[in-house]
């Protein structure tokens, strides 16, 4: 709870925000969890705390570890944890999965690729962009503010895109790179009223208290690239992100698949450490596109563990 993963490369700048944010202006203290040693606030240190931000200028592999931040108040201290991993730079071009930020999809009409985490840094335009380690050149590529725009997107534009920028701290410059995958959606096709393949309407899913459970919401929307198609889960009519129960999370990003030529999306709802109160909730799988919205409701019931007799 109140924990966030962050990663970076050695000799680059890394800035991490306290996962337990208070409002601006609150005092935030940072500690290295393993030793409970306070992180200094003086900027002359390579690693220092600056309010809600923890700065590694530059980062070293040995900085890896869990950092504790405490947002201070005389009546209500609030604690968060930043799990930081610093990796050695790769000698070859491949960017390993553990350094990749979330995948984004684009089409001929919409081809923005945002540079991940850039808002945490003090940077100035322009950004440098690379695809599969090659610097992007040509009029089709436009670096605009914190994102890359690709004109006339083609299937061949799919790949790993790296943004590179300079963070400036008190006159000193530090390099930062961040990589994410870009996939291209086919524009031809048609759309239909959403068809939910799973779960069945009013399905009862058996779960074991204390165990983890997954619910998959899967729907098809037509053929080819779909404009404004989404599947999502709701709890008691509330979006998962708004419901605010950290044990219950939607899988980041919607998986796209093509079943019999149809464009389908699925979203996995992960429930960690199932509790009694989870059985009282109504789980709605929603599929929506320009044609409308379809909803299938699931409820959980307790699965009685099977007795094992010798």
């Amino acid at each position: 709870k109140f924990s966030k993963q962050s990663w970076g490369l050695e000799n680059e700048a890394l800035i991490v925000r306290c996962p337990r944010q208070g409002k601006p202006s609150y005092t935030v203290d940072w500690y290295y969890s393993q030793t409970n040693k306070s992180i200094p606030t003086q900027e002359r240190n390579r690693v220092f705390a600056s309010g809600q931000l923890l700065k590694f200028l530059p980062a070293a592999v040995a900085d890896s570890g869990i950092y504790t931040c405490i947002v201070r108040s005389p009546t209500f201290n609030r604690t968060g944890y930043a799990n930081v991993t610093i990796y050695k730079k790769q000698s070859d071009c491949n960017v390993p999965d553990y350094l990749m930020y979330s995948t984004v999809s684009g089409s001929e009409k919409n081809s923005k690729i945002y540079c991940p985490t850039i808002d945490l840094y003090n940077w100035t335009a322009p950004l440098e962009w690379f695809k599969n380690c090659q610097a992007l050149q040509g009029s089709r590529y436009r670096a605009h503010k914190s994102f890359l725009v690709i004109d006339n997107v083609m299937t061949e534009d799919a790949g790993d895109y790296t943004c590179k920028f300079i963070h400036n701290e008190n006159g000193a410059n530090y390099s930062v790179t961040a990589t994410r995958s870009f996939t291209v959606k086919d524009e031809q096709g048609f759309s239909l009223f959403p068809v939910i393949g799973a779960p069945a309407q009013n399905e009862i899913k058996e779960v074991e208290i204390g165990k983890n459970a997954n619910l998959t919401c899967s729907a098809c929307f037509g053929k080819g690239t779909q404009f404004l198609a989404a599947v999502l889960w709701q709890l008691n009519g509330t979006k998962i992100t708004d419901f605010g129960e950290p044990r219950i999370q939607q899988e980041e990003g919607q998986n796209q698949s093509f079943s019999n030529g149809l464009a389908c999306l699925d979203m996995v709802l992960r429930i960690a450490d199932v509790k009694e109160e989870d059985l009282l909730l109504q789980y709605d799988c929603l599929a929506l596109n320009l044609h409308g919205l379809r909803r299938h409701t699931v409820r959980l019931s307790r699965k009685n563990p099977i007795d094992h007799h010798s």
Epitope: S73, T75, F76, T238, D242
Partner: antibody, heavy 117, light 111 residues
Framework: QVQLQESGPGLVKPSQTLSLTCTVS?????????WDWIRQPPGKGLEWIGY???????YYNPSLKSRVTISRDTSKNQFSLKLSSVTAADTAVYYC??????????WGQGTLVTVSS | DIVLTQSPASLAVSPGQRATITCRAS??????????MHWYQQKPGQPPKLLIY???NLESGVPARFSGSGSGTDFTLTINPVEANDAANYYC?????????FGQGTKLEIK
């Protein structure tokens, strides 16, 4: 967006127990924050009654502590106020609210409770 | 308990003019570099709404006409320029220690 709604009887007899419930939508009360009760007698100022934190810890105003209990029902995403041995001086609009750090950031619309025989 | 005393109890200000409300604490509400005083606005029939936190920080979405200042025991809420829809009761609140307490309120009327 956090939303709060108070519910409970609008009329309570003297010496009885006032019971109110606050239903929270848009956020789980076990995820974070503190969940407050505040009251305001007609035409008067605000008085903090107490709160229950996401962790279940409770903090009460000492002036009311002997008569107050704040509890929660996590399965319904609700928290409740019980105020015993009420008198006419307990007549007020009762608000539930959310404290994110030190300030009450989201409020219910309030419910008027009158203590009268 | 920390007692908060607001003054004046009421004031009337013309649109475009400045309104100043003060709040005095019975002991310091500042500690460890922060000042734990906050301001709320309450219109008739509505719950209070947070305006200023930590003495001088404007809450998100609140117009910049509102500002707060002060430290230790003496605090000021300023509205400049006042608009017609600023007519309301204004309360200070501290969070230096338990119990959290409010001032008795100041009623702002628009001439």
């Amino acid at each position: 967006q956090v939303q709060l709604q108070e519910s409970g009887p609008g009329l309570v007899k003297p010496s009885q127990t006032l019971s109110l419930t606050c239903t929270v939508s848009g956020y789980s009360i076990t995820s974070d924050y503190a969940w407050d009760w505040i009251r305001q007698p007609p035409g008067k100022g605000l008085e903090w009654i107490g709160y229950i934190r996401y962790s279940g810890d409770t903090y009460y105003n000492p002036s009311l502590k002997s008569r107050v209990t704040i509890s929660r029902d996590t399965s319904k995403n609700q928290f409740s106020l019980k105020l015993s041995s009420v008198t006419a001086a307990d007549t007020a609009v009762y608000y539930c609210a959310t404290t994110m750090m030190d300030t009450m950031d989201y409020w219910g619309q309030g419910t008027l409770v009158t203590v009268s025989s | 308990d920390i007692v908060l005393t607001q003054s004046p109890a009421s004031l009337a200000v013309s649109p475009g003019q400045r309104a100043t409300i003060t709040c005095r604490a019975s002991k310091s509400v500042s500690t460890s570099g922060n000042t734990y005083m906050h301001w709320y606005q309450q219109k008739p029939g509505q719950p209070p709404k947070l305006l200023i936190y930590l003495a001088s920080n404007l809450e998100s979405g609140v117009p910049a006409r509102f500002s707060g200042s002060g430290s230790g025991t003496d605090f000021t809420l300023t509205i400049n320029p006042v608009e017609a829809n600023d007519a309301a009761n204004y309360y200070c609140q501290h969070s230096r220690e338990f119990p959290l307490t409010f001032g008795q309120g100041t009623k702002l009327e628009i001439k």
